[in-house]
Interface confidence: low
Amino acid sequence: IVLRPSRVHNSEENTMRALTLKDILNGTFSYKTFFPNWISGQEYLHQSADNNIVLYNIETGQSYTILSNRTMKSVNASNYGLSPDRQFVYLESDYSKLWRYSYTATYYIYDLSNGEFVRGNELPRPIQYLCWSPVGSKLAYVYQNNIYLKQRPGDPPFQITFNGRENKIFNGIPDWVYEEEMLATKYALWWSPNGKFLAYAEFNDTDIPVIAYSYYGDEQYPRTINIPYPKAGAKNPVVRIFIIDTTYPAYVGPQEVPVPAMIASSDYYFSWLTWVTDERVCLQWLKRVQNVSVLSICDFREDWQTWDCPKTQEHIEESRTGWAGGFFVSTPVFSYDAISYYKIFSDKDGYKHIHYIKDTVENAIQITSGKWEAINIFRVTQDSLFYSSNEFEEYPGRRNIYRISIGSYPPSKKCVTCHLRKERCQYYTASFSDYAKYYALVCYGPGIPISTLHDGRTDQEIKILEENKELENALKNIQLPKEEIKKLEVDEITLWYKMILPPQFDRSKKYPLLIQVYGGPCSQSVRSVFAVNWISYLASKEGMVIALVDGRGTAFQGDKLLYAVYRKLGVYEVEDQITAVRKFIEMGFIDEKRIAIWGWSYGGYVSSLALASGTGLFKCGIAVAPVSSWEYYASVYTERFMGLPTKDDNLEHYKNSTVMARAEYFRNVDYLLIHGTADDNVHFQNSAQIAKALVNAQVDFQAMWYSDQNHGLSGLSTNHLYTHMTHFLKQCFSLSD
């Protein structure tokens, strides 16, 4: 059980107040984290509260401003990047968001040696991506879908690619589907460790069908947004990987890296690139049917100036029970011999664990094991491997950081974080300096988040970087809800749940229940993290019980649970939410006439199907930006879990799993359907089709659209959305306004 800080002494009770919706919408109780921007083994940069860029040296204890807020303000900079030789800083301004990760910006280069902006050969605008080389001060940037290189900031640019074209050919940046569903970055170029080579991807979207939607703006005619967007079964982008020698870029030009034969025989994806040395690179490829992944290690051939990827350096990863990997296929972390590597994949018992691969995957040495999962490898040094897992005390929703000593035999394991601040901190991430000389730990909860700095050799805490004192003080007179994380055992399935209870919760009373669901493959909602959000308010002020349940298809509890939904989306996720609700009713404090469910995105899909399940459990529910048919969603994501929408593959379940097919079942529930009209991700089409099916079935429902808003419904739309949903729920639960 996790009890959140909440005062219950009678003397204090009259000074305590419940959370208000305004608190949530204003972000009154948001927290800060501190991630050092490491620039060496013992130095990091940080942007101070007054916007100076400050360099901290941990060993001398000294700090000094390398860039003043005045310089930042002179170009309205909102971000910066120091060149590795510390001679220049790029300043980023005019940020203009595109998709989830991508944005364009204007870049200015500031010369630290003379305190002036670099004049002459200035960068064009707007730039789609810009980065320094890992050594020195070379610049690579993407402008108008082409890649350019500068040997020094003041030099004229060398144009590497020439075929870039908006919505057609993308060089060094991903197209929509690679950005959202494969790379999860705004860039698709990678410097070699010492900056000798630059690798980049070229995405050809020429033949991809285009999603078009209206952007209303305030013009007489709406604009049409066109995005090459492959939906399930559609034609996909064609990807090629090139590498250019940045010292003599004009000498031989970009050289294409060959695709493994077993991958190239049918549709495929490129999934990631990892440099090993300046002359060795590792590429990961994936078949379109995403249960076979190939890791290919390629070497530079000086004599031919080409890249050679011998079959002996191809490592195949295959899943026989689901798709390859978790959400993505994991990436390798190479050891100092520059050929062997550490990688997370399923062991024979179906749990994701760290393996050490020296020659073949078949001969991999398992490094971690147990009925829990290794989640991320942070750093490998000569003698230590740092990783995170959910092993400690068998709570899948926790994250602790571990160190394995690989320099000694047998390797010994130590939990770095398990006992540091046990009540406050059970969910960590980490950020390491060069050679793991120092590291920062960022604790996300369940107590108030705290960031600390540690010695990489002894794990000793050096200092607190951010402890959110103001937040702690602000919460002193707030009646926060209580939270508990527990599990249900049902038919050999473990369903972990988080319950958020009103501050004066009394087991003998009856409370309305709201289920908040996401439930997408490889997701996790039940996590030991701190949050003061909309559902906190609903429990604190409106007296609701809120529950989150991780059912089949969710992550970090083994492949049996994860791959249960393979080729069958929309079945078990819904069943498990319903099962949990029945168990909650049995607990005795839920008013079974006042149960609701809500979710966003995949959660909107699950909440819609739950409402249309015909169980009579739910009085009402909300779907925000739901998927309504898997034929409408992106190929890379959808086909990973569902296969292809073809007769000889899985078309039948594509058809059976739509929300529209269950339109009749909405007759006995109150349904609120919400979507942004400019949703580039889950297209408005999804909700349009639900609405059409409900109208055709003559089923009453409520709806709200947000004009020109994307999948995030940000800005003023957020306030309107949560206010609207609050009214809907209060009406449903007969709570006075």
Partner: nanobody, 123 residues
Framework: QVQLQESGGGLVQAGGSLRLSCAAS????????IGWFRQAPGKERELVAS???????NYADSVKGRFTISRDNAEKTVYLQMMSLEPEATGVYYC?????????????????WGQGTQVTVSS
């Protein structure tokens, strides 16, 4: 589909002013970004100023503060007001249109072009 026709060019003394017009035909003119490009003798076409479908403007550094681009969607016309002209401004001025961002400066990224109008600034 849009057709573009420039006018307003001519001979002017250094320090003088000119106003170029770009008249468009086509029902969906307001959906397009419009740019003015200059091609000096023996040089590539370069973007001088552009205006998005929503009215956001963008200028080359060399003309900032002296040139003003504006659009009248009702008249289906875009204007380029050029003040304090210098001899370097001499060239053929082309009006171009594209469906999308107005910030693209490469002429190959613009879809529709007018015939051009000559501007000569004498010293």
């Amino acid at each position: 589909q849009v057709q573009l026709q420039e006018s307003g060019g001519g001979l002017v003394q250094a320090g003088g002013s000119l106003r170029l017009s770009c008249a468009a035909s086509g029902r969906t003119f307001s959906m397009y970004a419009i740019g003015w490009f200059r091609q000096a003798p023996g040089k590539e076409r370069e973007l001088v100023a552009s205006i998005s479908s929503g009215g956001s403007t963008n200028y080359a550094d060399s003309v900032k503060g002296r040139f003003t681009i504006s659009r009248d969607n009702a008249e289906k016309t875009v204007y380029l007001q050029m003040m304090s002209l210098e001899p370097e401004a001499t060239g053929v001025y082309y009006c171009a249109a594209r469906d999308g961002s107005a910030l693209y400066t490469a002429h190959s990224d613009w879809d529709y072009w007018g015939q051009g109008t000559q501007v000569t600034v004498s010293s």
